[in-house]
């Protein structure tokens, strides 16, 4: 069977159909619509927004959408018991405190229910004590301070700049060296462009703008009280003090007016380099405590925030398959936003929107897809991935055996200069090819394709002629489908040049003043990169749903199994001695993926050349492709990562926003040098180097000829 | 169009206590320090205080600390200074300003460049 059996519409055509529907205008409109009010996670107002997409998508033409809720720990400023931060005097005066709320933006005066920023799940406390400016808190800065400088964190309160790594590693990574509590701030070096205005005149941070943010360790275990598990009526929840992630020490954000305050007054050593110093008129002195004349003067927290097990809401929305139903291409974004949500989340669910519609409209023309394709408006994505993750644990059985890929729809821009693809190596042909075939929206380009302005905006650092497409990290939504469940995932949005920008993510980013009028004035007036983010996104989708055989490429992943095995080999071998000692070798490694490669070159010829009329064939095939990435699953996960299971890619250790190659090995081999048993050390590395390389050939062998 | 209306003063004798009042308008009053400033007949300005744009903060100059308070209504849009203690050189024409920089506040350092002033209130301190 066709999969247009349900239309007369040509494939070509479809495909043409579902693109041209989606409009730049529309996607203004649903945005302008999804940012007029706050819709944070677990509250009335996102509820409504819930209900309203659920209205909106069954008006669309989907078969049928439905609400999941869920019970999840979710974290909340106390109304009347603000969070601040004081310097303190010898008496316990209290001369300075950081504000209580961020300068509303114009014509945002009167919005209630805008929450003040906080640090999510940060515990309740009143620390206080002398400060140590830790950089951006990543591990590094942590060894030069320790090692290097021999300043010990124990007992102080440390003062991070956001930006590198994700703040939950931060924060992490101060609990370990002893802090008692964390002030994150943002500084201008990371969040104030050279020449751009602060907003509401351009899309600069200003001065008491301040960046909210989750400060969760999960390593993916979704709701922190009910890992593994669903978060439904019947839940057996767990102690607060067992709860996954949590942090144990109060973290506070600030903006740079606020941390101006506190850094200028900072003595101690003075920073180890330039890479220490931002762009404050501050020494950035490491401390710890306040120079000679305010050496008396300390530094208070006051924390008092909650954390409440509360309802959130996921909107799934089905589209069902005409000839196989039961394999499902997912598109999901989040839908809660810390206030306004002007990029974060909703530039990604107002395409998402008119994605919807345009299927909507399709099949309202008589036209299915061939597969079922299933579209979710997450909640609770701000506090730790929540929604999604739960709805994947409640519904793991099917996903396993019916998942044939999951499309991320988060923000559509950080950006304006080029399009940024993160994706399984399964899907770089795919990306490639329809690149292809869209306009690229870029100035200059016109009547070029988008993968030439991506390509020579975003060239591969490998191949020539071909663009930059990078590894899966996690902190989105993607990571429950990818990580946990195995199953082949992307996201594509549009970036920043990061060449010429080096501040982190985009400035006003979960700030108050991200807001409609940012993107509308400032990022994507004419809503020309929303849509080509909604032809890439909604193109991938289509593909996936639609394509007779599944638009993956195993040779792509052998391809990048012979550079990930190169690299982490190589960084081995800066302990050659080591080596030699403890007898490790990484032949059984290297001969899995040369075995990898071989099976799927020879895989490749078979789909090129077998009967696709034949539909048991067909499936076949397909189900080899579909379960591919399933079989880089270790069903025991990660070593003390029992939710990061996929052997291939995980999260940084050190920074969960990015991806680390056989992440088993590299987290044996890091620092190894300072273990305190090398032998015991250096054992580890052999078994990972061991279950990496039984992976790698246990996944080729599913490529193998069935019989 | 940015608009402070300050109103209050008058005549007092030395020891007692005067609230001037400043109604602000055409801006997000909850997005700006405000500061009382005042100008002695003869001299130049002098800053008195300034709250931040939150309220959670609050600087004196020497000479009005621990008798003057300044606070602001957000649901009035209106900035106040509490005189108690008057003295005869407390006597000047007061006025309040506008920070010029959203959510800056901290001190009196540069209240000399505040952009917006109002017509000031004529406090008089005698016996």
């Known amino acids: 069977k066709s999969s247009n059996e349900a239309t007369n519409i040509t494939p070509k055509h479809n495909m043409k159909a579902f693109l041209d529907e989606l409009k730049a205008e529309n996607i203004k409109k649903f945005l302008y619509n999804f940012t007029q009010i706050p819709h944070l996670a677990g509250t009335e107002q996102n509820f409504q927004l819930a209900k309203q997409i659920q209205s909106q998508w069954k008006e669309f033409g989907l078969d049928s959408v439905e609400l999941a809720h869920y019970d999840v720990l979710l974290s909340y400023p106390n109304k009347t018991h603000p969070n601040y931060i004081s310097i303190i005097n010898e008496d316990g005066n209290e001369i300075f405190n950081t504000s209580l709320f961020e300068p509303p933006p114009p014509g945002y005066e009167n919005v209630s229910d805008i929450v003040p920023p906080f640090s999510a799940f940060s515990p309740q406390g009143m620390p206080e004590g002398d400060l140590v400016y830790v950089n951006y808190a990543r591990t590094e800065d942590f060894f030069k301070l320790e090692r290097d400088m021999k300043i010990n964190c124990s007992g102080k309160i440390v003062i991070a700049r956001y930006g590198k790594v994700f703040r939950g590693n931060k924060v992490k990574n101060a609990q370990l060296a002893g802090a008692k509590g964390v002030i994150l701030y943002s500084d201008p070096a990371d969040y104030f462009a050279p020449g751009v205005k602060s907003y509401p005149d351009g899309w600069n941070l200003p001065g008491g703008g301040v960046q909210r943010g989750n400060i969760l360790n999960l390593n993916g275990a979704g709701d922190p009280l009910t890992p593994g598990y669903p978060a439904n009526e019947y839940a057996y929840r767990r102690g607060i003090a067992e709860a996954v992630g949590l942090p144990s020490i109060p973290v506070h954000p600030i903006g740079y007016y606020d941390a101006q305050k506190l850094l200028e007054k900072m003595g101690g050593s003075a920073p180890p380099d330039s890479s220490w110093r931002g762009s404050l008129k501050v020494p950035y002195n490491v401390g710890p405590g306040f120079t000679g004349n305010f050496s008396t003067q300390k530094v208070k927290m006051h924390i008092h925030s909650t954390n409440e097990v509360t309802r959130i809401y996921n909107v799934i929305g089905t589209l069902r398959g005409a000839v196989e139903p039961d394999r499902y291409v997912i598109l999901g974004g989040h839908r809660d936003s810390w206030v306004f949500g002007g990029i974060d989340p909703q530039s990604g669910a107002a395409v998402v929107h008119e994605i919807v519609r345009s299927f909507g409209t399709l099949k309202k023309e008589g036209w299915r897809p061939r597969r079922t394709i299933l579209f979710a408006s997450w909640d609770a994505e701000e506090f730790g991935l929540l929604g999604s993750t739960e709805w994947a644990e409640e519904n793991s059985r099917l996903l396993q055996e019916r998942g044939v890929a999951y499309i991320n729809a988060d923000s559509s821009i950080e950006g304006n200069y080029t399009l940024r693809v993160d994706c399984t190596p399964l899907m770089y042909s795919l990306v490639h090819n329809l690149t292809k075939e869209l306009k690229s929206p870029d100035e200059g380009f016109e009547g070029k394709s988008l993968y030439e302005s991506w390509t020579k905006k975003s060239p591969s650092p490998e191949f020539s002629g071909m663009p930059r497409i990078s590894k899966l990290g996690s902190g989105n939504d993607f990571e429950v489908f990818f990580q946990r469940l195995g199953i082949a995932s992307g996201r594509a949005r549009y970036t920043k040049n990061w060449e010429t920008n080096k501040f982190s993510g985009y400035p006003l980013y979960h700030s108050v003043y991200e807001t409609y009028e940012l993107v509308e004035k400032f990022y994507d007036p004419m809503f020309k990169y929303h849509l080509t983010v909604a032809q890439v996104r909604g193109g991938m989708v289509f593909e996936l749903a639609n394509s007779i055989v599944l638009p993956f490429d195993c040779r792509d992943y052998a391809v990048v199994l012979r550079k990930y095995a190169d690299k982490i080999y190589s960084i081995s071998m800066k302990h050659p001695q080591e080596m030699k000692t403890y007898s490790v070798s990484f032949d059984s490694l290297f001969s899995a993926v040369k075995n990898f490669t071989e099976i799927a070159s020879k895989f490749s010829e078979r789909l090129q050349d077998f009967d696709k009329s034949n539909p048991i064939v067909l499936r076949m095939m397909n189900d080899q492709l579909m379960f591919l990435e399933r079989a880089f699953i270790d069903p025991l996960g990660l070593p003390d990562r029992p939710f990061y299971r996929h052997v291939i890619y995980a999260p940084s250790s050190h920074n969960k926003y990015a991806g680390e190659s056989f992440p088993g090995i590299y987290d044996a081999l890091f620092d190894i040098e300072s273990k305190v048993d090398p032998s015991k050390a250096w054992g580890e590395v052999k078994r990972q180097i061991y279950v990496a390389a039984f992976t790698v050939q246990a996944a080729a062998e599913t490529l193998s000829e069935v019989a | 169009q940015v608009q402070l209306v300050e109103s209050g003063g008058g005549v007092v004798q030395p020891g007692r206590s005067l609230r001037l009042s400043c109604a602000a308008s055409g801006f997000s009053f909850r997005s700006y320090g405000m500061h009382w400033v005042r100008q002695a007949p003869g001299k130049g300005l002098e800053w008195v205080a300034v709250i931040s744009y939150d309220g959670s903060n609050k600087y004196y100059a020497d000479s009005v600390k621990g008798r003057f308070t300044i606070s602001r209504d957000y649901s009035k849009n209106t900035l106040y200074l509490q005189m108690n203690s008057l003295r005869a050189e407390d006597t000047a024409v007061y006025y309040c300003?506008?920070?010029?920089?959203?959510?800056?506040?901290?001190?009196?350092?540069?209240?000399?460049?505040?952009?917006?002033r109002g017509q000031g209130t004529l406090v008089t301190v005698s016996s």
């Open positions: 300003a506008r920070e010029p920089r959203i959510g800056y506040y901290y001190d009196s350092s540069g209240y000399d460049s505040l952009d917006y």
